[in-house]
Interface confidence: low
């Protein structure tokens, strides 16, 4: 049959070469004489060469040792051909099959391997794992399954046996007990990994076993009784810096410090804080001590490591005793911020409150007043009493310095202390409103057509509150009623102003009285821009121009006409009518009302 | 590694105590430190105390007097226990691993958190 | 205790560029044994818990994409985000572990403009 069994060839052979390994042979060969090729990599193309065929016996033939390392099995196919080139059989698979020799060592990932484990730790703790590798087959052969051992253990102590190694997964771990950081912190195991499971060829490498501290050392005070003076009243002043030794390894979990207040500390007016570098207790007042309430704290400090103890160990206590120092306090205003109602406008020389400080210190000690800040300038206080009094006119609507009708006033107290000190405390004067002001009308100036005219609205404000303000009444004065009306709205906080009756273009003064709820009246004048216009207006347009904008000598002549008329009216309306002299504009007004009347008769 | 706030009600009244539990899997309460954290709305992170290893425990000093932190190894569960809630104590408290027990794991930092239980203190 | 200062308190940026945010400490966080500097950041996304993305004031957490770069010692800390993606809007706390209590800054809020 045309067919080949996969053939075996150890790597590394010695030759000689070529080296016939079967020979491949077709039944069709009796008809005819056949030839015979193989082609794939090894043989036509890379690695090239390295098989070959006699073309007429069809010996197989290997040109050059193998290497399973590089190429662990190859595949060609053999052809068969008759004389004139024809195929007599199909391409045959040919598997050719690099068998493995023990020809490498092992070889460890790293020359050097760092692990570490707790001292004290019980036998068959693991410490770390190691690896070797090795390119030789380790599937069908031995030769590159990897036994680990361990040589040598340097130190020797406490004897030469406290590590041991799995054979196969290279993990180290702990056989023997007695692991002492302080007597060993590092051990040097010098590993080896050997292939043919153990029999083979041997590579070596070095496992550092670094003996982690275990917290088999308690911290202990030294001293372990401290005494301390504190000034009352600091916070955060370091009252005492309480010392410990630690045998365990310094700046580790099991050296570090960490300081509990046992006791003493009832007001948990104490803290205790560890220095991160020298492992100091830092003890601190959280809050401030009061001589006259207890001069002296009696306080009783534990000291244990961050990392818990891995034994039982005793607990190391130290005893603070803290005498706490007098120190002159400064009074105290009661409350801290006062707040009294006084109505605005009060008569100079009337009592507004008495605000007075206690001094906490037991001694009694005379306290003085003074004002130290009046934006105002509207008080006075008794430097004995605490009296204040009023010695301008409050005014609840300076806006300068009165905010939300409250004027804010800073005193002062001190005691004849040595060095003495000072307390303030804070005035809060609630002003009360009375009906001080009047309302008014905004806007002042207002511009409107003589023709179809727009009525304005006039909103009116009052700086006092309520009640003293709206609703308004409005009124007008001076005769301004003549010409205008004002209404005042139902909500009764803005006024209408209207023109009643025809005004020649500019300026009128209109007297507006407007009175608030509680009666009080404030007089404004009106400065009203009348203009030659029809419905709304902003500013006054051009000269007025009457009819239909018609020029030349005969409009010239009407308008000297009218304006001899209007001087000759003028004239009786002065003679016959007596007004007020403030009433002229009016007068005009009334005059140019007799000028329309002629104009439109022209028109 | 997952940890799991569990609380009582999450309205607490003024002056009333608050008690959370955390239970922790994927990993051992004598391996790690657990620490609890709170937020207040719209706040930042407030640091409140440490569980360590071996059962000691570190507290913010400020809250020291009115809190607790204890654990059950055996049942992966770290308590929290606070007295004396005022309305500044709202909050959503969490609890969060420490990376390590030791000082070279970066022990004060904090790898896994839970997912936090929100705590109102109100009348 | 420690005061951790964080700032800006907010800043946007559009996706792509590259930010940075500062966190001071009241007192250095470097010790000087094992020349470490004990500091760590968080990312807190809305309505999440926070998640660590570096300690030792440089080291980043496993899993933490590289574009996050903690840097600086002793007082001055930096976390800078090489190229931002819209899901880094958060808010970053610095947080020092030198002392006790630990405290955290009070956070740096990164909007996507």
């Known amino acids: 049959d045309w067919v080949v069994a996969p053939i075996s060839v150890p790597e590394n052979g010695k030759g000689p070469f070529p080296q016939r390994l079967n020979q491949l042979k077709s039944n069709k060969d009796r008809d005819t004489k056949i030839f015979y090729s193989i082609t794939g990599p090894g043989a036509d193309s890379p690695p090239e060469g390295v098989f070959a065929v006699e073309k007429e016996t069809g010996w197989l033939l290997l040109n050059k040792p193998l290497d399973r390392e590089e190429i662990a099995k190859y595949e060609l196919f053999g052809h068969a051909v008759s004389e004139n080139g024809a195929s007599v059989e199909d391409p045959m698979n040919i598997s050719i099959i690099v068998t493995d020799q023990n020809d490498h060592k092992p070889k460890f990932t790293q020359d050097t391997f760092r692990g570490s484990v707790l001292e004290g730790v019980l036998p068959g703790t693991s410490v770390m794992q190691v690896t070797a590798t090795d390119e030789d087959d380790a599937i069908y052969t031995y030769n590159g399954v990897v036994a680990y051992s361990i040589h040598s253990q340097e130190p020797k102590e406490p004897h030469d046996l406290m590590f041991t190694i799995h054979k196969s997964t290279g993990t180290i771990s702990v056989i023997s007990s007695g692991l002492d950081r302080e007597k060993v912190p590092e051990y040097t195991l010098t590993i080896q990994a050997t292939d043919m499971d153990g029999d083979g060829s041997t590579t070596t490498a070095v496992a550092v076993v670094e003996i982690l501290d275990a917290n088999d050392n308690a911290p202990m005070f030294d001293p372990q009784k401290y005494e301390a003076h504190v000034p009352e009243n600091a916070v955060g002043h370091e009252v005492q810096r309480l010392t410990v030794t630690d045998l365990d390894a310094p700046n580790s979990p099991a050296w570090r410090a960490t300081y509990l207040i046992m006791g003493g500390d009832d007001g948990d007016h104490f803290t205790i804080t560890t220095h991160p570098e020298s492992n100091q207790g830092i003890l601190t007042t959280r809050k401030g001590l009061d001589f006259e309430a207890k001069n002296q704290h009696t306080l009783y400090v534990e000291v244990t490591n961050e990392a818990p103890f891995v034994l039982k160990l005793p607990t190391s206590t130290a005893t603070i005793v803290v005498h706490v120092e007098d120190v002159n306090e400064a009074p105290v205003f009661v409350p801290p911020s006062k707040v009294v109602e006084v109505q605005e406008g009060i008569p100079t020389g009337e009592p507004v409150c008495v605000y007075t400080a206690e001094d906490p210190d037991k001694e009694n000690q005379k306290i003085s007043y003074r004002i130290l800040r009046d934006p105002a300038g509207w008080l006075a206080m008794d430097p004995d009493s605490g009296q204040v009094t009023a010695v301008g006119t409050l005014d609840r609507e300076d806006e300068q310095f009165v905010r939300n009708n409250i004027y804010e006033v800073m005193v002062l107290a001190m005691d004849n202390g040595s060095p003495p000190t000072t307390g303030t405390g804070t005035l809060l004067l609630t002003l009360i409103d009375v009906n001080d002001h009047g309302p008014v009308p905004e806007p002042r100036q207002i511009t409107i057509c003589n023709q179809s005219p727009v009525r304005q609205v006039l909103n009116i404000t009052d700086k006092d509150l309520s009640p003293h303000t709206s609703p308004f009444q409005a009124q007008l004065t001076d005769d301004s009623d003549i010409y205008w009306t004002a209404e005042v709205n139902e909500e009764g906080d803005t006024v209408v102003l209207s023109l009643k009756k025809f005004l020649k273009q500019d300026t009128y003064d209109v007297h507006l009285s407007l009175s608030d709820h509680g009666n009080k009246e404030q007089l404004t004048v009106i400065r009203a821009t009348v203009c030659d216009c029809h419905g709304h207006v902003e500013t006054c347009p051009g000269p007025w121009k009457g009819g239909s904008g018609g020029g030349g000598s005969g409009a010239g002549v009407i308008a000297v006409i009218v304006v001899v008329v209007i001087a000759i009216v003028a004239g009786i309306v002065v003679l016959v009518i007596s007004r007020k002299k403030r009433m002229a504009k009016y007068e005009k007004a009334e005059i140019k009302e007799m000028g329309e009347m002629h104009r439109e008769l022209n028109a | 590694v997952q940890l799991v706030e569990e609380s009582g009600p999450g309205l607490v009244a003024p002056s009333q105590s608050l008690s959370i539990t955390c239970t922790v899997s994927?990993?051992?309460?004598?391996?790690?430190?657990i620490n609890w954290v709170r937020q207040p709305p719209g706040k930042g992170l407030e640091w409140l105390g440490v569980i360590w290893t071996g059962g000691g425990t570190n507290y913010d000093s400020a809250l020291k007097s009115r809190l607790t932190i204890s654990k059950d190894n055996s049942k992966s569960q770290v308590f929290l226990k606070m007295n004396s809630l005022q309305t500044d104590d709202t909050a959503r408290y969490y609890c969060?691993?420490?990376?390590?027990?030791?000082?070279?794991?970066?022990?004060?930092?904090?790898?896994?958190w839970g997912q936090g239980t929100t705590v109102t203190v109100s009348s | 205790e420690l005061v951790m200062t964080q700032s800006p308190s907010s800043l946007a940026v559009s996706v792509g560029e590259k930010v940075t945010m500062s966190c001071k400490s009241s007192q250095s966080l470097l010790y000087s044994s094992n020349q470490k500097n004990y500091l760590a950041w968080y990312q807190q996304k809305p309505g999440q818990s926070p998640k660590l993305l570096i300690y030792?004031?440089?080291t980043r957490e496993s899993g933490v994409p590289d574009r996050f770069t903690g840097s600086g010692s002793g007082t001055d800390f930096t976390l800078t985000i090489s190229s931002v993606k819209a899901e880094d809007l958060a808010v970053y706390y610095c947080q020092q572990y030198y002392s006790y209590p630990y405290t955290f800054g009070g956070g740096t809020k990164l909007e996507i403009k």
């Open positions: 969060a691993r420490s990376r390590g027990a030791y000082d070279f794991d970066g022990r004060g930092a904090m790898d896994y």
């Open positions: 030792w004031a440089s």
């Open positions: 994927g990993f051992s309460l004598t391996s790690y430190p």
